[in-house]
C-alpha cells in the first residue's frame, strides 16, 4: 500500500523535511503533491510527469519544494505554516489513481530559559518560594531539576501554570539546592543556569560533644557545642545555670568530683531571632561503674533494620570490649565498631544475629562485664512450603496438606482454594476427595509484626486417570564429553511408579545413566553423540498408566578430525583440483582452506582449475563448530608434475 513517511516527523523552523514515499507503484504516468488531506487542484504544490521528466509547479508551490523521481518531496527552510497534512496523487501507467497522505509538525527552536524567584532568602518552616521559568513559550514542555535530578515527589512541591512555576511550600533547609528549569519541544531542549536557594534556618537544638558524660578525676573536660544554623549560630555556656563564656568550646583542665553538674549550651541565630539550648549532665567518678548495654532497636526487622548496641556509661580514655555468643567478635562486613569501640552496629540484621551480646570496660586490674543482651530479630515469613509434594490424587483418599514458613513471630496461616478463603489454620484436611476437589490450593503466611505476607500455590488434580506425563530437561543442547543432562518426569504424583525408555527400549545398564528422586529423574553424565536418542517416561499406578511424548536429545559434538577426499596427492599439470573436506559435527561445522598457510575460501569444497607445478604445497582444511567452541584441522601435501612426467606414487 502506498504510504508517506515524514523524516523527521517533528521539524524545527528553518530546517528541512523529506516526505518519503513507500511502495510507489512500478509503472507510472506521473504524480502530484497537494497541501492538505485530499487532492485539490487549488492546493497543488508540484506535479511530475515520468515520460517527459517534467515538473510543473501548482498554486501552492512556494519555491522551497523539490520533487524527486521517486516521488519523494523535500521542503526546505520550513516555516510554521508548513505544519499539517500532505497528499500524494499518483497516476499509474494504466491511468488508475492512487492517493496517500502524510503529515509533519513544525516547532520553533527554543531560547535558553532563566529562573525568576519571588523570595531570595526564605525562612524555614515559614516561607514559600515560587520559581518561574522564563520566557513563556507556546507548545513547550517545562521540566524542573533539583541538584540535576528530576523533582522528588513531595506534597510541599507544587507545579502550576503549565509546569512553568515551581512552588516550594514551607521551605526546609533540605530545599537548599541547585534548581534548574528546562524547556522542551519535539525539536529542541534548553536548560537554564542553576539558581541556588538560600534557606534561613535554626538554630536546631545544639549537640554537645563528646557524648560521654562520665569522666575520671584528674582528666581535662573539653566540651564543644554545635547547632545547625544558617547563618551560623552564636554560642554561650552555662554551668549549673551560671554564665561562663560566649564561645563554641568550653575547656576545664584537671577536673575533680566538684565539677560534676549540668552544662548548658545556648545557640542564637541573629537572622531568625531564635534561641535553642541543650543540657548535659557531667559525672566525675573516682572509679568506673559496671557497664550495661543500650539498644536503639529492640525488635529489628531482618534485612531491613540496623541495630546499634552501645556500652554505657561513656567514660573518656577507657577501653571497651565486646563478645557475641561468649566469643570475641567475628570478622564480618555487617559488624561495625565505632572509633572508640563503644558502639557495635549490626548492619542489615539477620535471624542469626540474636546473640547474646556482652560488653566490658577494661579496668587497671580486671574487665567489668555487662549483663548479656539478646536481640529479638523479626523475620519472615519465608516462602511457605506445602507438604506433601504430590500434585495428583485418586478419588476417595483423604487430602491432608500442611503449610510451614519460617517466621518470627510465628506466622499466621490461611488456606484458599481457587482464590476462595477456606480456613485460618496451618493444616488443611479434606476427607474422601472427588474430582471436584481439583484446583489451585494457596497457603498464605502472614507475619503480623513485620507486616509481610508470602504465598505458595499448588495445583492439585484429583483423577482416577493419570495425566499424560511430560519430560523437562535442564540442558537442551549439551556438549559431548562435557555436559550432563537431567530429565525429569512431570508431574509428581502420589503412589506412582516412574519408568523410562530410550528408543522404545528399557534403560540400558550404564555407569553414565543414573535414576534418582524415586526414578522420576534420569541423569546422563558426560553425554556422547550416541545419547542423541528418543527418551520417553511413563507413569503408572494400580488404576492407570500413561507415557510422555518422546524428547530427542540434541547432543552438540565435534568437529572430528576432518577427511580430505579424494585421497590422491599427485596430479598432472592441467588437471582440475577438486578437494572436498568432511568432518563429523553437530551442528555442521564451518570449513576453511589454507594453501601453504595462506587463507583461501570458506567453503567445504576447494576447486582449482588447470593446476600447474605452482600449485604444489600443503593444503590444510580447518573446521570450526561455533556451538561447541571446538576446532580441528588436517593437512595434505599435493604434488603437481609437468604433463610429460609420470607421477610417482606417494602416500
Amino acid at each position: 500500500k502506498l504510504t508517506i513517511e515524514s523524516t523527521p516527523f517533528n521539524v524545527a523552523e528553518g530546517k528541512e523535511v523529506l516526505l518519503l514515499v513507500h511502495n510507489l507503484p512500478q509503472h507510472l504516468f506521473g504524480y502530484s503533491w497537494y497541501k492538505g488531506e485530499r487532492v485539490d487542484g487549488n492546493r497543488q504544490i508540484i506535479g511530475y510527469v515520468i515520460g517527459t521528466q517534467q515538473a510543473t509547479p501548482g498554486p501552492a508551490y512556494s519555491g522551497r519544494e523539490i520533487i524527486y523521481p521517486n516521488a519523494s518531496l523535500l521542503i526546505q527552510n520550513i516555516i510554521q505554516n508548513d505544519t499539517g497534512f500532505y497528499t500524494l496523487h499518483v497516476i499509474k501507467s494504466d491511468l488508475v489513481n492512487e492517493e496517500a497522505t502524510g503529515q509533519f509538525r513544525v516547532y520553533p527552536e527554543l531560547p535558553k530559559p532563566s529562573i525568576s524567584s519571588n523570595n531570595s532568602k526564605p525562612v524555614e518552616d515559614k516561607d514559600a518560594v515560587a520559581f518561574t521559568c522564563e520566557p513563556e513559550t507556546q507548545d513547550a514542555t517545562y521540566l524542573w531539576w533539583v541538584n540535576n535530578q528530576s523533582l522528588p515527589v513531595s506534597p510541599r512541591l507544587q507545579l502550576s501554570n503549565g509546569n512553568r512555576t515551581l512552588t516550594l511550600f514551607n521551605v526546609t533547609r533540605n530545599d537548599t539546592a541547585s534548581y534548574k528549569c528546562e524547556t522542551q519541544n519535539p525539536v529542541s531542549a534548553r536548560r537554564s543556569d542553576s539558581v541556588i536557594l538560600n534557606v534561613l534556618y535554626g538554630p536546631d537544638a545544639p549537640t554537645i560533644s563528646p557524648l560521654n558524660t562520665s569522666y575520671r578525676s584528674g582528666e581535662n573536660l573539653n566540651l564543644s557545642c554545635h547547632a545547625a544554623s544558617n547563618p551560623p549560630a552564636q554560642y554561650s555556656w552555662f554551668v549549673n545555670g551560671t554564665f561562663q563564656q560566649s564561645t563554641q568550646e568550653l575547656f576545664i583542665p584537671n577536673i575533680t568530683v566538684n565539677n560534676s553538674g549540668s552544662y548548658t549550651c545556648q545557640a542564637h541565630n541573629s537572622d531568625t531571632g531564635l534561641n535553642r539550648t541543650t543540657v548535659t549532665t557531667i559525672t566525675v567518678y573516682a572509679e568506673p561503674p559496671k557497664p550495661f548495654i543500650t539498644s536503639n532497636n529492640s525488635n529489628p526487622v531482618e534485612d531491613e533494620d540496623a541495630v546499634a548496641l552501645t556500652c554505657e556509661p561513656e567514660i573518656q580514655n577507657t577501653t571497651y570490649l565486646w563478645w557475641v555468643n561468649n566469643q570475641s567478635l567475628p570478622v564480618s562486613p555487617r559488624l561495625q565498631l565505632s572509633n572508640d569501640n563503644r558502639t557495635l552496629t549490626l548492619l542489615s540484621v539477620t535471624r542469626n544475629d540474636v546473640g547474646p551480646y556482652e560488653c566490658g570496660i577494661q579496668n587497671k586490674l580486671s574487665v567489668d562485664h555487662s549483663d548479656p543482651v539478646i536481640l529479638n530479630v523479626l523475620y519472615g515469613p519465608d516462602d511457605p512450603t506445602i507438604s506433601p509434594s504430590y500434585t495428583y490424587y485418586r478419588p476417595g483418599v483423604n487430602l491432608s496438606l500442611s503449610c510451614h514458613a519460617a517466621s518470627n513471630p510465628p506466622a499466621q496461616y490461611s488456606w484458599l482454594i481457587d482464590g476462595n478463603i477456606q480456613q485460618h489454620t496451618q493444616e488443611l484436611f479434606i476427607s474422601n476427595i472427588t474430582e471436584k476437589n481439583s484446583g489451585l490450593y494457596t497457603c498464605q503466611a502472614n507475619n503480623s509484626a513485620s507486616g509481610h505476607s508470602r504465598t505458595t500455590v499448588k495445583t492439585i488434580t484429583v483423577s482416577a486417570e493419570l495425566p499424560k506425563p511430560s519430560i523437562s530437561s535442564n540442558n537442551s543442547k549439551p556438549v559431548e564429553d562435557k555436559d550432563a543432562v537431567a530429565f525429569t518426569c512431570e508431574p509428581e504424583a502420589q503412589n506412582t511408579t516412574y519408568l523410562w525408555w530410550v528408543n522404545g527400549q528399557s534403560l540400558p545398564v550404564s555407569p553414565r545413566l543414573q535414576l534418582s528422586n524415586g526414578n522420576r529423574t534420569l541423569t546422563l553424565f558426560n553425554v556422547t553423540r550416541n545419547d542423541a536418542r528418543a527418551y520417553v517416561c511413563g507413569i503408572q499406578n494400580s488404576v492407570s498408566a500413561n507415557r510422555s511424548d518422546p524428547v530427542t536429545l540434541d547432543v552438540l559434538y565435534g568437529p572430528d578430525t576432518p577427511i580430505i577426499s579424494p585421497p590422491d596427492s599427485s596430479y598432472l599439470s592441467g588437471a582440475n583440483l577438486n578437494l572436498s573436506c568432511h568432518s563429523a559435527s553437530n551442528p555442521s561445522p564451518q570449513y576453511s582452506w589454507r594453501i601453504n598457510g595462506i587463507p583461501q575460501q570458506h567453503t567445504q569444497v576447494l576447486f582449482i582449475a588447470k593446476i600447474t607445478p605452482n600449485n604444489n604445497g600443503t593444503y590444510a582444511c580447518f573446521v570450526s563448530n561455533l556451538a561447541t567452541g571446538r576446532n580441528n584441522s588436517i593437512v595434505k601435501s599435493i604434488t603437481v608434475s609437468a604433463s610429460g612426467t609420470s607421477p610417482g606414487l606417494s602416500a
Epitope: 487532492v39 485539490d40 487542484g41 506535479g47 515520460g51 501548482g58 491511468l95
Partner: antibody
Framework: EVQLLESGGGLVQPGGSLRLSCAAS????????MSWARQAPGKGLEWVST????????YYADSVKGRFTISRDNSKNTLYLQINSLRAEDTAVYYC?????????????????WGQGTLVTVSS | QSALTQPASVSGSPGQSITISCTGT?????????VSWYQQHPGKAPKLMIY???NRPSGVSNRFSGSKSDNTASLTISGLQAEDEADYYC???????????FGIGTKVTVL
Amino acid sequence: EVQLLESGGGLVQPGGSLRLSCAASGFTFNTYGMSWARQAPGKGLEWVSTISGSGDNTYYADSVKGRFTISRDNSKNTLYLQINSLRAEDTAVYYCAKGGLLWFGELPYPFDYWGQGTLVTVSS
Amino acid sequence: QSALTQPASVSGSPGQSITISCTGTSSDVGGYNYVSWYQQHPGKAPKLMIYDVSNRPSGVSNRFSGSKSDNTASLTISGLQAEDEADYYCSSYISTSTLYVFGIGTKVTVL
C-alpha cells in the same frame, strides 16, 4: 467511478445560441483539464476545445474560435460550452471528455473518460 | 490543421492480427509522443484504448498494442474477436495553441 453527463443539446436555428453542460463525478475535478469533442452525423471525431484544471487557460479548434466559449465551475464540478452564431456545419453529437491537459501546466493528457454525448441540430 | 490520415477500412478473420496506420506530419505525430487511439462502437461514446503511443489504460485487453515510426503511428489488434468490430480513431497533440487533431477514422470489420 468516473461519470460525465452532458445536457443542453437540441434544435436551434442558424445564428442561434446554446449552452451545453457536463456534470462530472468520481474524480478530483479541479485537478484535470476538461475537453469538448464533436462528431457530425456519419463523420469522424473532431476536437473542439480544452480548458485547464484551474480554468485559467482555454484552447479552441480554428473552426470554432471566436464563436464557442469553454468554461468550468469547479465548485459545482461542471463543464460548460457556450455556442454562439451557430451554422449548419455545427450539427453534431457533442461529447464532454475528461483530460486533454493535466494539472496547471500545459501537460498533454489523454481523453480517458467520455460522456454519452448530447445532439445539437442547427436547422431552419 | 487537417485530420490525420487513416485507412477507411481494415478487415480480418477471427484470431488474425490487423494493423491500422495513422499518418501525420513532423508537426503532430512525428513531433510528439502524444498519440492516442480510441474505439467507438455504433451509437456509443469513444473509449480510450492506447495513449502516449504505446501505453494501455486499465481494463483494455493486451491484444491491443501501439507503436510509432517517424510520422506514422500504428494500432495492432492481435487475436481478432467479434467484439473488436468498431470504428477506430487516432489522435495527436499538435501544439500549445491548437492542442489536438483526430484521424479520419478506420472501420474494422471481423469477417
